[in-house]
């Protein structure tokens, strides 16, 4: 289904406007901000979600060491330009003609420049490391149980194929989820790891993007898993290009 037919809503994206104006009176949903039609049977792209968010009213040891090329989204929110497929355009600019290049998850990967800045291609983020710290519990979670439940979560809630969940590491209280998806691995219809990570990030923050579903309630053998902080690192297929000035700052 493209949307819930009964009341014409989008189960996977509450930041939409839906109406029965599709072919044969079918429910069709469009993302806020961009007005682009979205497929409500899967996750909406991060670019369209960010655009919708910006248009909405403002009140509404076994652990992996991130590589030196890992990016963290320090720039926060911006109103992105999305291509006709809903992906980030390689070059993003703000209203004051400051431009920069982004990767496939919309995170800046170059220094900021002016309108003459060129971004030849959209560089794919092929490895995402989600670093979580859980609240204290009576004892540590069983690593195997934790792996099983986090895989189930990504599979069931975000429809991410298990082969893209490369690993779940655990050293109490730190959990690391590694998502990997090369361009060659991603088939038509596969959820993008960047979109899954964004939905997960919003769920963890208590800002679920799903329509009408309760927030994320994750339990491992009945024990609630409550996250108190999240850090997400992004690794691109081509390392980012920042000046030494930024790296030493």
């Amino acid at each position: 289904h493209t949307a819930a037919q009964d009341n014409c809503t989008c189960p996977t994206n509450k930041m939409t406007v839906c109406s029965p104006d599709g072919p044969g009176g079918r429910c069709q949903c469009r993302a806020l901000g961009s007005g682009m039609a979205v497929d409500c049977s899967t996750l909406t792209s991060k670019c369209l979600l960010l655009k919708a968010r910006m248009s909405a009213p403002k009140n509404a040891r076994t652990l992996v060491r991130p590589s030196e090329h890992a990016l963290v989204d320090n720039d926060g929110l911006y109103d992105p330009d999305c291509d006709p497929e809903g992906r980030f355009k390689a070059r993003q600019c703000n209203q004051t003609s400051v431009c920069w290049c982004v990767n496939s998850v919309g995170v800046r990967r170059t220094d900021k420049g002016d309108l003459s800045l060129r971004c030849d291609e959209l560089v794919r983020t092929h490895h995402i490391l989600i670093d979580l710290r859980h609240r204290p519990t009576a004892g540590a979670f069983n690593h195997s149980d934790l792996d099983a439940e986090l895989r189930r979560l990504f599979r069931e809630r975000y429809r991410l194929h298990p082969k893209f969940v490369a690993a779940v590491h655990y050293e109490q209280p730190t959990i690391q989820i590694e998502l990997r998806q090369n361009t060659s691995q991603k088939a038509a219809g596969d959820v993008d790891i960047g979109d899954a990570a964004y939905y997960f990030e919003r769920d963890i923050k208590g800002e679920s993007l799903f329509q009408g579903r309760g927030g994320l309630d994750l339990r491992v053998r009945g024990e609630p898993l409550q996250v108190e902080r999240t850090l997400i690192y992004y690794l691109d297929e081509i390392p980012p290009k920042f000046s030494m000035k930024r790296l030493t700052a």
């Epitope: 690593h143 195997s144 149980d145 792996d147 099983a148 439940e149 895989r151 189930r152 599979r155 069931e156 809630r157 194929h161 298990p162 082969k163 969940v165 490369a166 690993a167 779940v168 579903r213 309760g214 309630d217 339990r219 491992v220 053998r221 009945g222 024990e223």
Partner: antibody, heavy 117, light 111 residues
Framework: QVQLQESGPGLVKPSQTLSLTCTVS?????????WNWIRQPPGKGLEWIGY???????LYNPSLKSRVTISRDTSKNQFSLKLSRVTAADTAVYYC??????????WGQGTLVTVSS | DIQMTQSPSSLSASVGDRVTITCRAS??????????LHWYQQKPGKAPKLLIY???NLESGVPSRFSGKGSGTDFTLTISSLQPEDFATYYC?????????FGQGTKLEIK
Amino acid sequence: QVQLQESGPGLVKPSQTLSLTCTVSGYSISSGYYWNWIRQPPGKGLEWIGYISYSGRNLYNPSLKSRVTISRDTSKNQFSLKLSRVTAADTAVYYCARDTTAYFDYWGQGTLVTVSS
Amino acid sequence: DIQMTQSPSSLSASVGDRVTITCRASESVSSSVNRFLHWYQQKPGKAPKLLIYRASNLESGVPSRFSGKGSGTDFTLTISSLQPEDFATYYCQQSNEDPYTFGQGTKLEIK
């Protein structure tokens, strides 16, 4: 000790809706785990139908998704299966089972449902 | 869907024999930490009973003559010394991907 018990009519007419209930004792279905329905046609293997989670989320087998609804009544500690538009191919022993971390550790004893006019 | 293929489909053996049943998945059912492959025993007119979870973990109360091993796509269930109560049908099940799927079963009969 966790126990599961299926109940419901043993005979359903073709094109009607099969309705079964699983009553759980010894554990609250809203406290954790995943509560499943599995079926087994006479003399055949096992087929997973779907589950409802501790938080009320559903996951169904795509081969049955258009006909299946699994719901729950936490006040009675029960979860239910509805399978619409049944045919003779839906004749089976229906089991409810608890999924711990993706395996089934507790099962009901099963109930045979025959689809026949 | 992941297809689970068990071999043999049926097997005749005697009390005291060592028996091995194989289960092959059409794609890997392992993660870096887990092997999402489980074994059940079913006797006529009864519900299946969990024997082994995650490929090699013995469920509480299951005799130690049962053991499991394997990873990726190939798994085995071994009964080291058959007892009269072991004659039953055995099923493997994967839970790496939904829908969860079972093998077609291996019927273990008395020779």
